[in-house]
């Protein structure tokens, strides 16, 4: 069971300092941006991180949403990352959800975050290069110290 708490506005970056944004095709991508680029591309660069209480002690449960024309929420259904047109719900009556991730602070690096899927244990949000694009994907952690699954989260409010 997950119960919604508060939300905060955040900019999410990978460890190469590329900014996460949602493109015109609703795809989550990373791109090099100056601070002014980041501001100019808002609200596509501003993510709503909603925190949830969890009936089990598993970590800080969150959803990641973006509000362009409508609110879309990040999902990892079938291990495929996409934004679904939906508001983060007030309650989720299940112990797993495709839209709930556990935000984890890497021990020894308070400012580095990982987002583990509640549906697929051991699978994390990651940045992966595909041709010329840097995509947000769901990835099984396969090597120790994998930088692709680490992010920084900068609160904007």
């Amino acid at each position: 069971y997950f119960g919604k708490l508060e939300s905060k506005l955040s900019v999410i970056r990978n460890l190469n300092d590329q900014v996460l944004f949602i493109d015109q095709g609703n795809r989550p991508l990373f791109e090099d941006m100056t601070d002014s680029d980041c501001r100019d591309n808002a609200p596509r660069t501003i993510f709503i991180i909603s925190m949830y209480k969890d009936s089990q002690p598993r970590g800080m449960a969150v959803t990641i949403s973006v509000k362009c024309e409508k609110i879309s929420t990040l999902s990892c259904e079938n291990k495929i990352i996409s934004f679904k047109e939906m508001n983060p719900p007030d309650n989720i009556k299940d112990t797993k959800s495709d839209i709930i991730f556990f935000q984890r602070s890497v021990p020894g690096h308070d400012n580095k975050m990982q987002f583990e899927s509640s549906s697929y244990e051991g699978y994390f949000l990651a940045c992966e290069k595909e041709r010329d694009l840097f995509k947000l994907i769901l990835k099984k952690e396969d090597e120790l110290g994998d930088r692709s699954i680490m992010f920084t989260v900068q609160n904007e409010d």
Epitope: K53, M60, R104, D110
Partner: antibody
Framework: EVQLVQSGAEVKKPGSSVKVSCKAS????????ISWVRQAPGQGLEWMGN????????YYAQKFQGRVTITADESTSTAYMELSSLRSEDTAVYYC????????????WGQGTLVTVSS | QSVLTQPPSASGTPGQRVTISCSGS????????VNWYQQLPGTAPKLLIY???HRPSGVPDRFSGSKSGTSASLAISGLQSEDEADYYC???????????FGGGTKLTVL
């Protein structure tokens, strides 16, 4: 780097209560779990329970259920552990520990507070 | 009596490789991650290994963890005198809905 600073040593009578504090400085406090773990002289570690300050959710080990109360004050970044109906077997060093990665991964520990229960 | 079983003591000479075992059951290690802590004499425990085999920054790569079935182990290679300490394994136990520690292993560097 987060630092957890605990209150000083206490000597208590059997049947009384003790309240130990744990103040966090230099990092995020509210969204992570704070656990309390005790260690009797010459013995191993024993988890008592935890709190997620932001949600107020608490989880207690069955052994301590009804006797321990864990609270947190977000405004001062301080967590508290109160243990009641003290007996001599409760003589131990009590540690608070922060869990930022997972509620059960204690990545930062306080210095410990010795509680002695003696008549 | 601890839910997780560790040998009470272990020893080795400088430069040697030492392994400390931690045995549990399907209600804890078999279905959950294992963490390891080092407690130097007179100090608070310190996180050494988390999630079976991950090292926090600052922990030397001489320390490694592994898990197989309902058991886990901590390996220390190139043993040094400063490794003399108590080592504790920890996991989550579903049957007691509680986090559990092993009884601890006192490592002596001869």
């Amino acid at each position: 780097e987060v630092q957890l600073v605990q209150s000083g040593a206490e000597v208590k009578k059997p049947g009384s209560s003790v309240k130990v504090s744990c103040k966090a400085s230099g990092g995020t406090f509210n969204s992570y779990a704070i656990s309390w773990v005790r260690q009797a002289p010459g013995q191993g570690l024993e988890w008592m329970g935890n709190i997620i300050p932001m949600t107020g959710q608490t989880y207690y080990a069955q052994k301590f259920q009804g006797r321990v109360t864990i609270t947190a004050d977000e405004s001062t970044s301080t967590a508290y552990m109160e243990l009641s109906s003290l007996r001599s077997e409760d003589t131990a060093v009590y540690y608070c520990a922060r869990a930022a990665y997972h509620p059960l991964v204690f990545d930062n520990w306080g210095q410990g507070t010795l509680v002695t229960v003696s008549s | 009596q601890s839910v997780l079983t560790q040998p009470p003591s272990a020893s080795g000479t400088p430069g040697q490789r030492v392994t400390i075992s931690c045995s549990g059951s399907s209600s804890n290690i078999g279905n959950h991650y294992v963490n390891w802590y080092q407690q130097l004499p007179g100090t608070a425990p310190k996180l050494l290994i988390y999630r079976n085999n991950h090292r926090p920054s600052g922990v030397p790569d001489r320390f490694s963890g592994s898990k197989s079935g309902t058991s886990a182990s901590l390996a220390i290679s190139g043993l040094q005198s400063e490794d003399e300490a108590d080592y504790y394994c920890q996991s989550w136990d579903y049957s007691g809905f509680s986090t559990v520690f092993g009884g601890g292993t006192k490592l002596t560097v001869l």
